[in-house]
């Protein structure tokens, strides 16, 4: 079986996640691709996903998480914006490919995401260096409902310093003007 | 093997600008991330900002945000970096740095500095 | 701002010595730190990235250890060529940061 593997990233809260999802551009160019998070013992559960089939760098975005496919460069870019300590878990990329299981991108992120010193430079958001607006033209794409039980069977261990985000959390309110500070990133 | 060529030696007066060039060979250019570092005479590494072309915009450190704009032209493989408002303190030689995408195994996007340019001396003095 | 302390400062050792140079960031970085070396009047020169990941073309008496906020650059065998200045830097989250730098002597 493969292993699966693990990347942990430490930030603050206002914070934002960017990391890029590599795939073999020619086999996944036009798939669906989605962002999940997985939590112990559960299905994996999708929390925003591109639109079908996916579109060329057309950002699609759900409540703080922004999904942009890069067909021409096989490269999935998720960020998740001003993040709250509830954000914490380990989260991954898939590619829908109905009828068959979703094709997980490896590694998983382990998202530990920790109380920011308010006015402290580099903690939160008044500290970052970019500005960015989300595109008006940004979609909620309708993801498929199942996922793969091939990507629960084991279960990683869980950080120490993970905090299992909330159903309630999921819900993300919609951000227009968010100030990114990647992990570049 | 990436290679990185900067633009040559400038002597500016405080209060204008410089734009500084680095042409790369060899790598994925568009989705690989370009950084700038500055060093000044007898300090350390001071990252300025950088860029992923295919991603458009730059982001800055705090302390030269306003005075510095980094871009890119994926038509050339080029990389540019502008800093205005010159003063005495800006004398250094600064550094273009390039992060060869890689593929599979890591999200991780500006990976470590990989390859450097060989470093453009910039000397404000009235 | 991630605030990196390396120590030592400065550091004199002899050919074939086995030299540890640290670094410390002042908040949680996972694994996301890089070594530099850098010579009088040349560009620095990457030597690890990801904390234990030697970049191509380094030899293999350089290596890096550690994790979260302590991490260690180990030179097992100094040669001649390896006296210089080195730097970590980490790339956790913007802005990124770099160490002051150890220099290396020697002795």
């Known amino acids: 079986a493969t292993k699966l593997t693990e990347e942990k990233y430490e930030l603050k809260e206002g914070q934002t996640l960017d990391v890029k999802c590599d795939y073999t551009l020619e086999k996944f160019a036009s798939s669906q691709k989605a962002w999940q998070i997985i939590r112990d013992g559960e299905m994996p559960k999708t929390l925003a996903c591109t639109e079908r089939p996916s579109k060329n760098s057309h950002p699609v975005q759900v409540g703080r998480i922004i999904l942009e496919d890069y067909h021409d460069h096989g490269l999935l870019r998720v960020r998740m914006v001003n993040l709250q300590v509830e954000d914490s878990g380990l989260y991954q990329c898939v590619i829908y490919q109905p009828p068959k299981e979703p094709h997980m991108l490896f590694d998983r992120i382990r998202l530990v995401v920790t109380k920011g010193f308010s006015g402290t430079p580099g903690s939160n958001e008044n500290s970052t260096q970019n500005v960015y607006k989300i595109p008006p033209t940004t979609t909620k794409a309708l993801c498929p409902l199942y996922t793969s039980p091939r990507t629960v069977t084991q279960a990683p261990p869980k950080s120490t310093a993970d905090v299992s985000t909330p159903d309630s959390e999921i819900n993300l309110t919609n951000v227009t003007d968010i100030i990114r500070v990647p992990v570049f990133n | 093997q990436v290679q990185l060529v900067q633009s040559g030696a400038e002597v500016k007066k405080p209060g204008s600008s410089v734009k500084v060039s680095c042409k790369t060979s060899g790598g994925t250019f568009s989705s690989s991330a370009v950084s700038w570092v500055r060093q000044a005479p007898g300090q350390g590494l001071e990252w300025m900002g950088g860029?992923?072309?295919?991603?458009?915009?730059?982001d800055y450190a705090q302390k030269f945000q306003g005075r510095v704009t980094i871009t890119a032209d994926a038509s050339t493989s080029t990389g540019y970096m502008e800093l205005s408002s010159l003063r005495s303190e800006d004398t250094a030689v600064y550094y273009c740095?390039?992060?060869?995408?890689?593929?599979?195994?890591?999200?991780?996007?500006?990976?470590?500095?990989?390859?450097w340019g060989q470093g453009t001396t910039v000397t404000v003095s009235s | 701002d991630i605030q990196m302390t390396q120590s030592p400062t400065s550091l004199s050792a002899s050919v074939g010595d086995r030299v540890t140079i640290t670094c410390r960031a002042s908040?949680?970085?996972?694994?996301?730190l890089a070594w530099y070396q850098q010579k009088p009047e040349k560009a620095p020169k990457s030597l690890i990235y990801?904390?234990?990941s030697l970049q191509s073309g380094v030899p293999s008496r350089f290596s890096g250890s550690g994790s979260g906020t302590d991490f260690t650059l180990t030179i097992s065998s100094l040669q001649p060529e390896d006296f210089a200045t080195y730097y970590c830097?980490?790339?956790?989250?913007?802005?990124?940061?770099f160490g002051q730098g150890t220099k290396l002597e020697i002795k």
């Open positions: 990801a904390a234990s």
């Open positions: 860029i992923t072309p295919i991603f458009g915009t730059a």
């Open positions: 830097q980490q790339y956790n989250s913007y802005p990124y940061t």
């Open positions: 908040q949680g970085i996972s694994s996301w």
């Open positions: 740095a390039f992060t060869p995408r890689y593929r599979g195994s890591s999200h991780h996007y500006y990976y470590a500095l990989g390859v």
